[in-house]
Interface confidence: low
Amino acid sequence: EAYKSEIAHRYNDLGEEHFRGLVLVAFSQYLQQCPFEDHVKLAKEVTEFAKACAAEESGANCDKSLHTLFGDKLCTVASLRDKYGDMADCCEKQEPDRNECFLAHKDDNPGFPPLVAPEPDALCAAFQDNEQLFLGKYLYEIARRHPYFYAPELLYYAQQYKGVFAECCQAADKAACLGPKIEALREKVLLSSAKERFKCASLQKFGDRAFKAWSVARLSQRFPKADFAEISKVVTDLTKVHKECCHGDLLECADDRADLAKYMCENQDSISTKLKECCDKPVLEKSQCLAEVERDELPGDLPSLAADFVEDKEVCKNYQEAKDVFLGTFLYEYARRHPEYSVSLLLRLAKEYEATLEKCCATDDPPTCYAKVLDEFKPLVDEPQNLVKTNCELFEKLGEYGFQNALLVRYTKKAPQVSTPTLVEVSRKLGKVGTKCCKKPESERMSCAEDFLSVVLNRLCVLHEKTPVSERVTKCCSESLVNRRPCFSGLEVDETYVPKEFNAETFTFHADLCTLPEAEKQVKKQTALVELLKHKPKATDEQLKTVMGDFGAFVEKCCAAENKEGCFSEEGPKLVAAAQAALV
């Protein structure tokens, strides 16, 4: 159905509150440096305009596209040239180039300081004083730090955030109530951001086909009772939703996501028996619930895969007549039977199956050629299984911090050219896979670990793309989405690396280290470890262990000293000299 006014259509569908929130998120994701007040003003003006168009669709400018309206609004920002430099040139372009230009300027690493919560009393006062402004500030702060955050999901988290304050600001001990709840929400938000960034990268770098394949595998595992046509329909709609959000079309994205939730609830009988309680919730919670819903039970009477994909005489005919549909069916059938496999592994198996058919269907005797195809999957399955087993054993032995350090050493040796903050950030996140997945039952470990690693390695790829310094990282990131993790796992020590010159400043520490929270203290130590490795890449694990042990003792000693700063300035150079001698 064609609407006279696109903006009125979205305003009517979404309602004023969600509309205003999404506009605020969109502007904050595009103009990440602008102050909150400027964005509130822009969002208010756009919402007022949309409301006027909803009242009178043939009003002036109401027929303009959303990109035109939003772009025109962004280009009115006076400080655009000063704050964003090149980005101001976007305003000289016509749509759709102008929007593409804004998208290309999104900064995945804007370098804002981490959000530090003020005192609970001050927070509660601000919350009670102006709830709408308080939640708007939350949307703004998350959106500008995460320019690809899945906008409808961010509205959901803002609602959760509101719930936490509504509850805890009534509590006797506000801090005790807020602390753990805010921290738990923060973890969820960070994971959500990384997952959506991975989806956007899949779409932007590898195209719709890659994203659809990923979604077919994931949804087939989750809804094994649904038939392939139903999975395909949901995947097609889901692809549209994520393409819109990744492309900055947040109003369309949120609207289409609500429509998809409605469709799934109206057709739950043919999708999954687990959707019932999600479908009774309001729209934001409903969509979130559906996205997180537990896996349905497998149907009991699934025939062997071999019948359709190996033994059937028509395999090559079926493949050649409709390659993507046939391969999609294979992926669907394999995934629904193997909920314990990671999505990445399932996609590798489908790729292997495709390569086998390409080769065999061109021979004189295809059935003989592909007869053992399913047996040939074994090494592909064994590789992630062994990797998870080995790394979980290491995690259990070392604990999270020790495991992170082991990964830091591993990844710094693989790609020493990568910036130290990136190596520290990525290795710390990779290390969290242990905490997140190793305690799970065997049947869930691989899926948890490998799919989480894919998301974290995507962060490395995104950061590296901004300033490419390592050919091998570029290669692993760009050659194949499903083989990224095996590619990184397979990287050996970079023998071509020329050690970094020693810089005493890098290893100079001060008393302020003592007052840092534990996590930040760890980051400082891990930064020193990376720098040490960049200076002495041939250092053995044993040597590094000794040096890091000495470093920990040095920090502990100086933080306990009467004159902390004096201790750091006196003992620090001795430690550095000893470390250099130990690492010769």
Epitope: D86, K93, E100, C101, L103, A104, E465, K466, T467
Partner: nanobody
Framework: EVQLLESGGGLVQPGGSLRLSCAAS????????VAWFRQAPGKGREFVAG????????YYADSVKGRFTISRDNSKNTLYLQMNSLRPEDTAVYYC???????????????????WGQGTLVTVSS
């Protein structure tokens, strides 16, 4: 490492046209932001036109807008500059420059480009 090699320069009359090519090796051209700069005798390097990495967003200096067109052929790993309605003041050595990493937007600042070709001379004179 990116190697760039320009060609297509020469002598042309005012109002005439030329097409410059820049062949890249060592990295795919669509993975880098690339630009044309020029340097007239006794002057500094001046941005002419650029195209973003991973996205075909083009930029032009005001002095060439509407006359010059930048494009690339990913299959040939080559960047082009189609120059029409040439004027005597377009006389210069034209350089192709690359700034790896996508989706980077081209910049008009020469210092931000680590890789340069050796240049090709364009002379506009009657």
């Amino acid at each position: 490492e990116v190697q760039l090699l320009e060609s297509g320069g020469g002598l042309v009359q005012p109002g005439g046209s030329l097409r410059l090519s820049c062949a890249a090796s060592g990295r795919y051209i669509d993975e880098t932001a690339v630009a044309w700069f020029r340097q007239a005798p006794g002057k500094g390097r001046e941005f002419v036109a650029g195209i973003g990495g991973g996205v075909d967003i083009t930029y032009y200096a005001d002095s060439v807008k509407g006359r010059f067109t930048i494009s690339r052929d990913n299959s040939k790993n080559t960047l082009y500059l189609q120059m029409n309605s040439l004027r005597p003041e377009d006389t210069a050595v034209y350089y192709c420059a690359a700034r790896p990493g996508r989706p980077l937007i081209t910049s008009k600042v020469a210092d931000l480009y680590p890789y340069w070709g050796q240049g090709t001379l364009v002379t506009v004179s009657s």
